[in-house]
């Protein structure tokens, strides 16, 4: 099966690569615009200059292309935490990221929120906190993971996972008591 | 405690309009971002739109983005959700709830109110 084209990608597969195919004349293949520019004027005939323009402060295109108009530059989300990694350049978007001893968590493809990296308080650390995953914990004896905090097994009820965990916890206070001296 | 009750569901048809509403109780409600999630049937949660404390930033998913409007009013404790050309694929369940600050999961939920979008 031939996979469906849209009409711009059909236009551009007739010219050779780092060209398109001129919307008006479909005989003439335009050259694209560099990173960082976009297209003010279609080229007027074969082998003659794109009008290509450069993109104005707060706008980007990250490829050649022959866009109208440049992107808009991406604002970093600070009230999800993010900080500006890079700013935005004509040929590059903004970068946006989270502080050191910061982790992001995607709540959706495109949208993330800046969160602290667990310490691992009461425990030790598995795996070390990373650019999109919260440190990984492994919790000391007496004490089991929720929510990646190591919690007291003194907070463990039995309908709760953590009885397995806690279990051995309970044995041994348990064998304690029972080996009293007689 | 807190308390997050939302309203305003319905039966409607495609391209109508329906304004949901989420009452809030038992926390600073002025000092918190707060957001709409939905799930449709058979389907995980999927973020639709916040606004943060002031009601001046707001974020909406593409998929609702031109139709949708967050607002809030701070006074009545209230968060609004305006949903105008609804659309088959905007039928779910729709929840508020209060942005995370320490840890990403939700600590509280409202019950939902349920949006059907069918002729």
């Known amino acids: 099966l031939v996979p469906h084209l849209g009409d711009r990608e059909k236009r551009d597969s007739v010219c050779p690569q780092g060209k398109y195919i001129h919307p008006q004349n479909n005989s003439i293949c335009c050259t694209k615009c560099h990173k960082g520019t976009y297209l003010y004027n279609d080229c007027p005939g074969p082998g003659q200059d794109t009008d290509c323009r450069e993109c104005e402060s707060g706008s980007f295109t990250a490829s050649e292309n022959h866009l109208r108009h440049c992107l808009s530059c991406s604002k970093c989300r600070k009230e999800m935490g993010q900080v500006e990694i890079s700013s935005c350049t004509v040929d590059r978007d903004t970068v946006c990221g989270c502080r050191k001893n910061q982790y992001r968590h995607y709540w959706s493809e495109n949208l993330f929120q800046c969160f602290n990296c667990s310490l691992c308080l009461n425990g030790t650390v598995h795996l070390s906190c990373q650019e999109k995953q919260n440190t990984v914990c492994t919790c000391h004896a007496g004490f089991f993971l929720r929510e990646n905090e190591c919690v007291s097994c003194s907070n463990c009820k039995k309908s709760l996972e953590c009885t397995k965990l806690c279990l051995p916890q309970i044995e041994n206070v348990k064998g304690t008591e029972d080996s009293g001296t007689t | 405690e807190v308390q997050l009750l939302e309203s305003g569901g319905g039966l409607v048809q495609p391209g109508g309009s329906l304004r949901l509403s989420c009452a809030a109780s038992?926390?600073?409600?002025?000092?918190?971002?707060m957001i709409w999630v939905r799930q449709a049937p058979g389907k995980g949660l999927e973020w639709v739109s916040y606004?943060?404390?002031?009601?001046?930033?707001?974020y909406y998913a593409d998929s609702v983005k031109g139709r949708f409007t967050i607002s809030r009013d701070n006074s009545k404790n209230t968060l609004y959700l305006q949903m105008n050309s609804l659309r088959a694929e905007d039928t779910a369940v729709y929840y508020c709830?209060?942005?995370?600050?320490?840890?990403?999961?939700?600590?509280?939920w409202g019950q939902g109110t349920l949006v059907t979008v069918s002729s």
């Open positions: 038992g926390f600073t409600f002025n000092a918190y971002t």
């Open positions: 709830a209060k942005l995370p600050r320490a840890a990403p999961r939700f600590d509280y």
């Open positions: 606004i943060d404390p002031h009601g001046t930033i707001t």
